[in-house]
């Protein structure tokens, strides 16, 4: 059984553990620039002209919902976007047109590493504070595919990148989130 996506009537969607995010709609107002203007991916194939590759890490910020609850703060996730390979028919920095060789290796822009983030949820009706952990993409890369690769092989996760283990601490008061209740009530 896989982890279900974090969704609210199919509107805001954040991937659950073990799932990949779909790139958000292009006109979404919460998406901002590509990191470093579309920083070059880890690319073993023709790495000389990195400006030709467009595997980008896009930051996408939104509130998460779970049932009637909403995250206390917006969460920023990273979405892997773009083609891995020279952009077809697009001029490069010095005006030449580059073509993607049809028989060349196939690269896919996919998540490379993940992090888990604990999200505090605010719920209506004086509910006890609740939390959820979501798995978010930490970085993207171009991964080379061969005819033998299938979808499941695309989904092999990168190195563990969740926050480092902290020392155990006494937990905060269980009702600590109640102070935020008024804010939530205004949201419904």
């Amino acid at each position: 059984q896989g982890w279900q996506a974090f969704r609210n009537d199919a509107t805001e969607v954040i991937p659950g553990l073990g799932e990949y995010p779909e790139p958000p709609p292009e006109n979404n107002q919460t998406m901002n620039r590509a990191e470093n203007g579309g920083r070059p991916p880890h690319h073993p194939y023709d790495a000389k002209d990195v400006s030709e590759y467009s595997c980008r890490e896009l930051h996408y910020t939104r509130f998460l919902t779970d049932g009637p609850c909403r995250s206390a703060k917006p969460v920023t996730e990273l979405v892997c976007s773009g083609q891995c390979g020279p952009a077809r028919l697009l001029p490069n920095a010095i005006g030449r047109v580059k073509w993607w060789r049809p028989n060349g290796p196939d690269f896919r822009c996919i998540p490379d590493r993940y992090r888990a983030q604990r999200v505090q949820l605010l719920c209506p009706g004086g509910a006890a504070p609740r939390s959820r952990k979501v798995r978010l993409v930490a970085s993207c890369k171009c991964k080379r595919l061969t005819r033998f690769h299938n979808q499941s092989e695309l989904k092999d996760f990168g190195p563990e990148t969740a926050r480092p283990q902290k020392g155990r601490k006494p937990r905060p008061g269980a009702r600590g989130a109640k102070a935020n209740q008024a804010e939530l009530e205004n949201a419904y």
């Epitope: 059984q1 982890w3 659950g16 553990l17 073990g18 779970d66 049932g67 009637p68 888990a116 604990r118 719920c123 209506p124 009706g125 004086g126 509910a127 006890a128 609740r130 939390s131 959820r132 952990k133 979501v134 798995r135 563990e160 969740a162 926050r163 283990q165 902290k166 020392g167 155990r168 601490k169 937990r171 905060p172 269980a174």
Partner: antibody
Framework: QVQLVQSGAEVKKPGASVKVSCKVS????????QHWVRQAPGKGLEWMGW????????EYASKFQGRVTMTEDTSTDTAYMELSSLRSEDTAVYYC???????????WGQGTTVTVSS | DIQMTQSPSSLSASVGDRVTITCKAS??????VAWYQQKPGKAPKLLIY???TRWTGVPSRFSGSGSGTDFTLTISSLQPEDFATYYC?????????FGGGTKVEIK
Amino acid sequence: QVQLVQSGAEVKKPGASVKVSCKVSGFPIKHHFQHWVRQAPGKGLEWMGWSDPEIGDTEYASKFQGRVTMTEDTSTDTAYMELSSLRSEDTAVYYCATGDTTYKFDFWGQGTTVTVSS
Amino acid sequence: DIQMTQSPSSLSASVGDRVTITCKASQDVHTAVAWYQQKPGKAPKLLIYWASTRWTGVPSRFSGSGSGTDFTLTISSLQPEDFATYYCQQYHDYPWTFGGGTKVEIK
């Protein structure tokens, strides 16, 4: 494939402590919350508490406060539940469960029978 | 603590029957209710959460409804593998509490 494998059955005397382990595989334990639920013979389910292995945060049911301790070893992806000052009413099957929230139990271990008897 | 009262405590039904189990909370829990299925000698399995959302892999014959204090688990057409005990659970306020269970037996 998510799997939770618990330690074997235990027989304890009243006043003693028991420590049950739960080995998680299929994901890093710190990406989830760990829950413990018990079930007395022929009875219903009783939630004991949850812990967040990543930061050591815990929430215990008031009934078990002061008697229960939930810990984890993230290097081995193993959760532990220790219950002290045992009495006969603590005889039950103890289940570990895991999930991405503090409130629902997505995957469960097979259970560990703890018998408290003099 | 919030009490969750399930009814009936047991019922007999045949394969193909429509089965309805109810759960009543001692106070308003909004939609913070989950349902679990447990077979003898086995661990429970999550079926429904947020009162009506089916967990991954749960057959569509299982459905949940309700809000506030009254909740229902419905099995639209009982299958041989559905004979088990069903528990509701509230997670509106600590401590999370379960109903006493409803045992669904073969008629």
